[in-house]
């Protein structure tokens, strides 16, 4: 949990208790089960990607 | 440039208990994982935990959990994993190395690795 | 546990001519976000473990272009265009979408 009185992190980053800091949710392509990718939104939509030729 | 340089060799009896060392430099510390890494003689790579050094939180494979103690010191950039009751089974080459968590993926560092022997 | 199995478990390999190895994963190590968390090592004789390619098909800082990966989901193959002298060791895949980290058993390339 975040300390209380603490700043609740910016848009986009989510509190790590592993790491006692906000971390960038884009991090989680690097490591999707570090303990922060838990509070961070639904992932990013998927690149486009066309279904035939 | 990142480095891990692991303590030496180690021979001990069995029931002992061995604390092996990693220390890091030409990072910050505290900003990355440091996972533990078994290889027995011949064998294969077993992973057998990690920790976030700037709060000490630890993870641990079922199969180490109790046999292996993850620690590390802030201000000496060092890792340690203490082995505790030995047995010959024991015996392997065990691997410190640094795990991002970042966006922009730059690759897992290893130290040496630190051969240790139980034998009576 | 994720179970990553490899294969060959040894390779003889004649230097200039290409290489391949095969590896699965018990569940797909494709993520939501489209990345596959497959991950390939060299542990040269004597050395340890250094990085080839990550999350799949991602070469590693200084790994030469003739290493490649390929696949996705529960199947993958590290490929070596042309296989140099120095390009013995054992070759590992492990995964990294959750905890444990776990590896295969090893390919073992050799020249031979």
């Known amino acids: 949990e975040q300390a209380p009185g603490t700043a609740p992190c910016s848009r986009g980053s989510s509190w790590s208790a592993d790491l006692d800091k906000c971390m960038d949710c884009a991090s989680c392509r690097a490591r999707p089960h570090s303990d922060f990718c838990l509070g961070c939104a639904a992932a990013p939509p998927a690149p486009f990607r066309l279904l035939w030729p | 440039q990142v480095q891990l340089v692991q303590s030496g060799a180690e021979v001990k009896k069995p029931g002992a208990s061995v604390k092996v060392s990693c220390k890091a430099s030409?990072?910050?510390?505290?900003?990355?994982?440091i996972a533990w890494v078994k290889q027995a003689p011949g064998q294969g790579l077993e992973w057998i935990g990690e920790?976030?050094?700037?709060?000490?939180?630890?993870y641990y494979s079922e199969k180490f959990r109790g046999k292996a103690t993850l620690t590390a010191d802030t201000s000496t950039s060092t890792a340690y994993m203490e082995l505790s009751s030995l047995r010959s089974e024991d015996t392997a080459v065990y691997f410190c190395a640094r795990r991002t968590i970042y966006y922009d993926y730059d690759g897992d560092y290893w130290g040496q690795g630190t051969l240790v022997t139980v034998s009576s | 546990d994720i179970v990553m199995t490899q294969s060959p478990l040894s390779l003889p390999v004649t230097p200039g001519e290409p290489a391949s190895i095969s590896c699965r994963s018990s569940q797909s190590l494709l993520h939501s976000n489209w990345i596959n968390y497959l991950y390939w090592y060299l542990q040269k004789p004597g050395q340890s473990p250094q990085l080839l390619i990550y999350q799949g098909s991602n070469r590693a800082s200084g790994v030469p272009d003739r290493f490649s990966g390929s696949g996705s989901g529960t199947d993958f193959t590290l490929k070596i265009s042309r296989v140099e002298a120095e390009d013995v060791g054992v070759y590992y895949c492990?995964?990294?979408?959750?905890?444990?980290?776990?590896f295969g058993q090893g390919t073992k390339v050799e020249i031979k």
């Open positions: 030409g990072y910050t510390f505290t900003d990355f994982i």
């Open positions: 492990a995964h990294n979408l959750e905890l444990p980290w776990t």
């Open positions: 920790i976030y050094p700037g709060t000490g939180r630890t």
